[in-house]
């Protein structure tokens, strides 16, 4: 449906409030270093222009594409060259190359100061003084730090953020009310950002077919009663939504997501029995709720897949006629029967099936060739099952912090060239799989664990892509999206690595460690652990444990001392010497 003015169309569909919020998110995700005030000014100018187009769609420039309008606006920023360097060259290009250029310069790890949470009273005063600016600042700060954050979902987070301040700033104990809510929003926000980053990586690095395969598997697990045609329609629409958001087309994305939620709710009888509550909610909550909805019950009677996909004499004929449709049906039928499998496992099985048909349908006796295809699935199924069992046992034995440390050592030995902050961040997140998934019954463990690990390993991949240092990481990240986790699991100690030279400065600590939160103190200790492994990759578990125990005792002792700084200086020297001796450095 062609509109004379795209900007007017989106303004009318979304309403002024959402329009302004989404433009702000879009601009902050592109120009991540620009000051808040500059972005607000740009957004206001775009909004005023949009209003003129709503009043008269034939007005000057109203027929221009959103990319042209937004790109032109971004290119008016005076400090573009000095702030962003070569990104300024994007402005010399024409659309659509200019937008592609901006997308390529999105930075997953921008050099921005850590967000420090002010005192509760300070935040509440700011909220009451100017609620609109306060909420815009939230959108801006999150968007610039997470340039692929799912924009319509960020509107939902902002709504919850506002609700938290509205409720808690008038509570008797503001801090007790507000801080847990902000912690929850922060943790959920990080998880949401990482999940969306994987979707965008899937689309951008592996293409639409890869994303669609993922969506078929996930939606078939979630909506096992829906027919294949219905799932296919949802997959097509969902792919469009995520392609738009990942491509910076946030207005179209939010609009199409709302349409998809509307369609799902209007057709819930043929999709899922679990949607009723979601569909009674307002738009932002509704879309979020649908995205998180639990799997529907499986239909009462599903036959064995063997009849259609192995025994039928038409397997090769059906495959040849429409390969992707036939494979899509295979994936749909398999996934709806297996909510206990991870999506990536289902995709591995489908890939194995595809490879087998490619080979066998060209053979003299195709049926004889592919008759035992499901035997090939067994090792693929058992590998993640065994891995999860072993790691959950280790997690239950060690607890989260020590389990993270075990992973830190494991991954530092696999890929010691990766920067220490990245290894710490990724290993800490990998370690969270324990508390997140091991509590589940076996039927829910694999989808929880392996699909979560895919999200975390994608963080490693996007951070590594910015400054590649390890061929092994590049290989695991680029060869196959669904085999990333098995690829990393299979890596052994990197025997080619030349140990880092010992630097006492790395292991010099000061009294400021005593005022850190427990989490920040853990990160300091884990940073030291990674550095130890980089110095001594062949160190045994026992050696590392001894050094880490000494380190913990040293921190505890000096934090209790009267003269903390002197203690850290003197005892620190002793600790370094003892550690060197223990590790044979």
């Amino acid at each position: 449906d062609a509109h004379k003015s795209e900007v007017a169309h989106r303004f009318k569909d979304l309403g002024e409030e959402n329009f302004k919020a989404l433009v702000l998110i879009a601009f902050a995700q592109y120009l991540q270093q620009c000051p808040f005030e500059d972005h607000v000014k740009l957004v206001n100018e775009v909004t005023e222009f949009a209003k003129t187009c709503v009043a008269d769609e034939s007005a000057e420039n109203c027929d221009k594409s959103l990319h042209t309008l937004f790109g032109d606006k971004l290119c008016t920023v005076a400090t573009l060259r000095e702030t962003y360097g070569e990104m300024a060259d994007c402005c010399a290009k024409q659309e659509p190359e200019r937008n592609e250029c901006f997308l390529q310069h999105k930075d997953d790890n921008p050099n921005l100061p850590r967000l420090v949470r002010p005192e509760v009273d300070v935040m509440c005063t700011a909220f009451h003084d100017n609620e609109e600016t306060f909420l815009k600042k939230y959108l801006y700060e999150i968007a610039r730090r997470h340039p692929y954050f799912y924009a319509p979902e960020l509107l939902f987070f902002a709504k919850r953020y506002k609700a938290a301040f509205t409720e808690c700033c008038q509570a008797a104990d503001k801090a007790a009310c507000l801080l847990p809510k902000l912690d929850e929003l922060r943790d959920e926000g990080k998880a949401s950002s990482a999940k969306q980053r994987l979707k965008c990586a899937s689309l951008q690095k592996f293409g639409e077919r890869a994303f669609k395969a993922w969506a078929v598997a996930r939606l078939s697990q979630r909506f096992p009663k829906a027919e294949f045609a219905e799932v296919s329609k949802l997959v097509t629409d969902l792919t469009k939504v995520h392609t738009e958001c990942c491509h910076g087309d946030l207005l179209e994305c939010a609009d199409d997501r709302a349409d998809l939620a509307k369609y799902i709710c209007e057709n819930q009888d043929s999709i899922s029995s679990k949607l009723k509550e979601c569909c009674e909610k307002p738009l932002l909550e509704k879309s979020h709720c649908i995205a998180e909805v639990e799997n529907d019950e499986m239909p009462a009677d599903l036959p064995s897949l063997a009849a259609d996909f192995v025994e039928s004499k038409d397997v090769c004929k059906n495959y040849a006629e429409a390969k992707d449709v036939f494979l899509g049906m295979f994936l749909y039928e398999y996934a709806r029967r297996h909510p206990d499998y991870s999506v990536v496992l289902l995709l591995r099985l489908a890939k194995t099936y595809e490879t087998t048909l490619e080979k066998c349908c060209a053979a003299a006796d195709p049926h004889e060739c592919y008759a035992k295809v499901f035997d090939e699935f067994k090792p693929l199924v058992e590998e993640p099952q065994n891995l999860i069992k072993q790691n959950c046992e280790l997690f239950e034995q060690l607890g989260e912090y020590k389990f993270q440390n075990a992973l830190l050592v494991r991954y530092t030995k696999k890929v010691p060239q990766v920067s220490t902050p990245t290894l710490v961040e990724v290993s800490r997140n990998l370690g969270k799989v324990g508390s997140k998934c091991c509590k589940h019954p076996e039927a829910k463990r694999m989808p929880c664990a392996e699909d979560y690990l895919s999200v975390v390993l994608n963080q490693l991949c996007v951070l590594h892509e910015k400054t590649p240092v390890s061929d092994r990481v590049t290989k695991c990240c680029t060869e196959s999206l669904v085999n990333r986790r098995p690829c990393f699991s299979a890596l052994e100690v990197d025997e080619t690595y030349v140990p880092k030279e010992f630097n006492a400065e790395t292991f010099t600590f000061h009294a400021d460690i005593c005022t850190l939160s427990e989490k920040e103190r853990q990160i300091k200790k884990q940073t030291a652990l990674v550095e130890l492994v980089k110095h001594k990759p062949k160190a045994t578990k026992e050696q590392l444990k001894a050094v880490m125990d000494d380190f913990a005792a040293f921190v505890e002792k000096c934090c209790k001392a009267d003269d903390k700084e002197t203690c850290f200086a003197e005892e620190g020297k002793k600790l370094v010497a003892a550690s060197q001796a223990a590790l044979g450095l």
Epitope: A300, P303, S304, P339, F374, K378, A443
Partner: nanobody
Framework: DVQLVESGGGVVQPGGSLRLSCAAS????????MGWFRRAPGKEREFVAA????????YYADSVKGRFTISRDNSKKTVYLQMNSLRPEDTALYYC?????????????????WGQGTLVTVSS
């Protein structure tokens, strides 16, 4: 969890019949695909027959098609294997299995719970 106990095995002459039963305790079986597998002396465990959750679909190994019939009574939490025209090569330990999620009924790795087995000997 489901506990499975097989019964009905025994010694029978070639051409004879036996009816095996598999009684479940613990959870209801209506949400499980139920299957029978067997292991002959010195051989690998092999699939025999399986039945879908409500009993609408059955699936058999080629070697038993037309001779064996699998059925279930969800209200009694029991699965049956009627074995006719028995042959010496049917001699094996017969196991009952339950799979919460099963796409390929013939694959042992898709079954979560297993009985201890009942012995069937076909001999003249």
């Amino acid at each position: 969890d489901v506990q499975l106990v097989e019964s009905g095995g025994g010694v029978v002459q070639p051409g004879g019949s036996l009816r095996l039963s598999c009684a479940a305790s613990g959870s209801t079986i209506s949400s499980y695909v139920m299957g029978w597998f067997r292991r002959a002396p010195g051989k690998e465990r092999e699939f025999v027959a399986a039945i879908s959750r409500s009993g609408g679909y059955t699936y058999y190994a080629d070697s038993v098609k037309g001779r064996f019939t699998i059925s279930r009574d969800n209200s009694k939490k029991t699965v049956y294997l009627q074995m006719n025209s028995l042959r010496p090569e049917d001699t094996a330990l017969y196991y009952c299995a339950a799979g919460r999620y099963s796409a390929w009924y013939s694959q042992s790795y898709e079954y979560d719970y297993w009985g201890q087995g009942t012995l069937v000997t076909v001999s003249s």
